[in-house]
Structures are given as structure tokens and as C-alpha cells.
């Protein structure tokens, strides 16, 4: 899925109201030096495409993110905020059903929530680089790539 | 416990350079971005510029391009500012400060290093 | 850049009572808006973010509001020790800018 014509803002919003909270109790617990973000993102489109990725992609050691709340609401923000996007879920929501039936919670699974804050807060802030990559701080024109 | 601890306090000739240092603690420094802002004596804040210790990359208010520098140091978890050709306009308490963890505010500071600018 | 105005640049409000410190930026920063307070002596601290959201730790009586422009920060009951300034701050567009603070005092 190409996550261009996403709504930014609205997602944005969504993450900061409800979605970063339940990141914040699943991670209850852990010490904030246990890991290091190693997914990075540049822009905002690529962003959604890892945070996607890492949220619904069942991984070694870590198959049962779908299900949690924070995934959920993820999903649900992006169906809303993204244009076409639940048309192309059909498969990931069957392979979310089948995941149901286990809910552990593992060290990787852990680091792999530890990855998505990291992805999201790079979502949210303006782009470091200036290299012309699509400007996170652009509601009005927000499909044009510009400098800062 | 995450903490911000900033070197003493500098005394400066104008058109010398001062490097202020901030080391983290409580956190896994590569993670978060560092950002650096001044405040002059009875004044309000200032936004000087933004670093992100996992890769190096930088953005700096343009009022300071040129003149400010920030580097971090991965293996001892320490963010640094330089400034140069310093005039007696950046006498200044100079505060580093780190992303929140949505990366949208500064929650945790240093407690601050006073640079004074003075002939 | 985006200019942060705040008004007023004091405030003087009963022990008890609502006090609120409004901010406008010069062009639309969207919802990221930040607000600090600052104690004589002190490192800035985070109140709230992205207009409305609580940091962890932040009394009630503190509260955001706003979009595009303009933006208010209302604590609601004024303690002794809410005493400071207080900054806006937009994180919309660089370079990041703050308001010129706000002090607020008993009366």
C-alpha cells in the first residue's frame, strides 16, 4: 500500500490521543535503556509503511502484535485516514484472526514495540534532514516535497 | 530515572568559542533527539537547534548556522553545542533538552550553563 | 519563521481563581502547540503537548485548547506554586519558536 495520500494530520492525531498510551502500558515495566531503535524512517509515507510492517507482520520470536489494543486502533486510524487502505487488509485481517489465539507477551515482541514508538516519534517530528524528503510539518500542500 | 546533566559555567572573550556538554542518563541516548535552546538574562527561550545522536543528522535555526555546532557522542551518551565567534548578545543560559517520547515537547532539561560573553 | 505571541506578558490572579494565557502563532501550526512553565532559577518544564495532552504528573487544574492560530492555556484554580512563566511553543515548522512567556502572579 502507498500511504502518500493518507491523511497525516489526522493519523497524527489519533497516535497521540489514544495509540501512544497503549504503546506506553504494553510497555509498562521495561527499562527505558533495555533497547535501541534500529528501523528508521524518512518521511512520512515510508513511516507508515515500517510502522505497518512492524505492527501487523508476524516476526521471529514476536507473531501476536495484531491483536493488542494499540494495533487495533492503528488499524483503525489507517482504514479512517488512508484512502483504499482496508481493501487491501483482507488477508491481514485473516492472518490477525488466526494469531488470536496466542497473547504473549515476549522480550522481542517488547523490543519490537520499543522500534515502533521509535517510528512513530519520527512520524510526528519535522524531518531532520534536509535533503528535499516530504516535509512532516505540511498540512496545507502535504503531498508536496519541498525544503524546510 | 532519566537525567540531563550539563558542564559548569563559562566565562568567554568575545570572538572565542565555548563547547557545552550534556550527558544523559536513564535512557538509551541514541533514541532520542537532543535539542538545545537559550535563554539571556531576563529573557524568554530560544531555539538554537536539534540533534539526533542515533545518526548524526542536525537542523539549526538559521540564526545560529555557522556559528553553532552540535555533535553527540554515542559511546559516552553526551550531546555537545559549540559556539563560535561568540559576542557579548550570547551571554546566555544555554539548555540542552530531550523528545518526549511521541517526539512532539522537550520533557526532561538540563539544569542549565551559563555562558557570559564578556571583555 | 512563525511568530508566537502571547498575551498578556503578565497576569496578576487571586489564589483560587482562573487564570488564562493565550498564544497566537502567525501563521496555522496545525495542533502542535506546547506549553512550558518556568520557575525563577529553574530549567523550563512540560505542562502540556500538542494543545491538550496531559504530561504524565500535570495537575488537572492545568488544561490546552485551541487550533490553527490561537491557543489558550487556562489553569483553572490558581495554586501558590503555579508562580512562573509560561511559554508556548510551536513544533510545526522550523525553526521550532516559543512564545515571549507569560508571568504569572498572585494578587
Known amino acids: 500500500y502507498d500511504f502518500t495520500n493518507c491523511d497525516f494530520e489526522k493519523i497524527k492525531a489519533a497516535y497521540l490521543s489514544t495509540i501512544s498510551k497503549d504503546l506506553i502500558t504494553y510497555m509498562s515495566g521495561t527499562k527505558s535503556t533495555e533497547f535501541n531503535n534500529t528501523v528508521s524512517c524518512s518521511n512520512r509515507p515510508h513511516c507508515l509503511t515500517e510502522i505497518q510492517s512492524l505492527t501487523f507482520n508476524p516476526t521471529a520470536g514476536c507473531a501476536s502484535l495484531a491483536k493488542e489494543m494499540f494495533a487495533m486502533k492503528t488499524k483503525a486510524a489507517l482504514a479512517i485516514w488512508c484512502p483504499g487502505y482496508s481493501e487491501t487488509q483482507i488477508n491481514a485481517t485473516q492472518a490477525m484472526k488466526k494469531a488470536r489465539k496466542s497473547k504473549v507477551t515476549t522480550n522481542k515482541c517488547l523490543e519490537q514495540v520499543s522500534q515502533l514508538q521509535g517510528l512513530w516519534r519520527r512520524f510526528n517530528r519535522p524531518l531532520l534532514k534536509q535533503q528535499g524528503s516530504s516535509d512532516y510539518k505540511d498540512d496545507d500542500d502535504k503531498h508536496h516535497h519541498h525544503h524546510h | 530515572e532519566v537525567q540531563l546533566v550539563q558542564s559548569g559555567a563559562e566565562v568567554k572573550k568575545p570572538g572565542s568559542s565555548v563547547k557545552v556538554s550534556c550527558k544523559a542518563s536513564g535512557y538509551t541516548f541514541s533514541n532520542y533527539l537532543i535539542e538545545w535552546v537559550r535563554q539571556a538574562p531576563g529573557q524568554g527561550l530560544e531555539w538554537i537547534g536539534v540533534?539526533?545522536?542515533?545518526?548524526?543528522?542536525?537542523n539549526y535555526n538559521e540564526n545560529f548556522k555557522g556559528r553553532a555546532t552540535l555533535t553527540a557522542d554515542k559511546s559516552t551518551s553526551t550531546a555537545y553545542i559549540e559556539l563560535s565567534s561568540l559576542r557579548s548578545e550570547d551571554t546566555a543560559v544555554y539548555y540542552c533538552?530531550?523528545?518526549?517520547?511521541?517526539?512532539?515537547?522537550?520533557?526532561?532539561w538540563g539544569q542549565g550553563t551559563t555562558v557570559t560573553v564578556s571583555s | 519563521d512563525i511568530v508566537m505571541t502571547q498575551s498578556p506578558d503578565s497576569l496578576a490572579v487571586s489564589l483560587g481563581e482562573r487564570a488564562t494565557i493565550n498564544c497566537k502563532a502567525s501563521?496555522?501550526?496545525?495542533?502542535?502547540v506546547t506549553w512550558y512553565q518556568q520557575k525563577p532559577g529553574q530549567s523550563p518544564k512540560l505542562l502540556i503537548y500538542y494543545v491538550s495532552q496531559h504530561y504524565t504528573g500535570v495537575p488537572d487544574r492545568f488544561s490546552g485548547s485551541g487550533s490553527g492560530t490561537d491557543f489558550t492555556l487556562t489553569i483553572s484554580s490558581l495554586q501558590a506554586e503555579d508562580v512562573a512563566v509560561y511559554y508556548c511553543q510551536q513544533h510545526h515548522r522550523f525553526p521550532l519558536t516559543f512564545g515571549q512567556g507569560t508571568k504569572l502572579e498572585i494578587k
Open positions: 540533534i539526533d545522536p542515533g545518526n548524526g543528522d542536525t
Open positions: 533538552a530531550r523528545e518526549d517520547n511521541t517526539g512532539t515537547a522537550f520533557d526532561y
Open positions: 501563521q496555522s501550526v496545525s495542533s502542535d
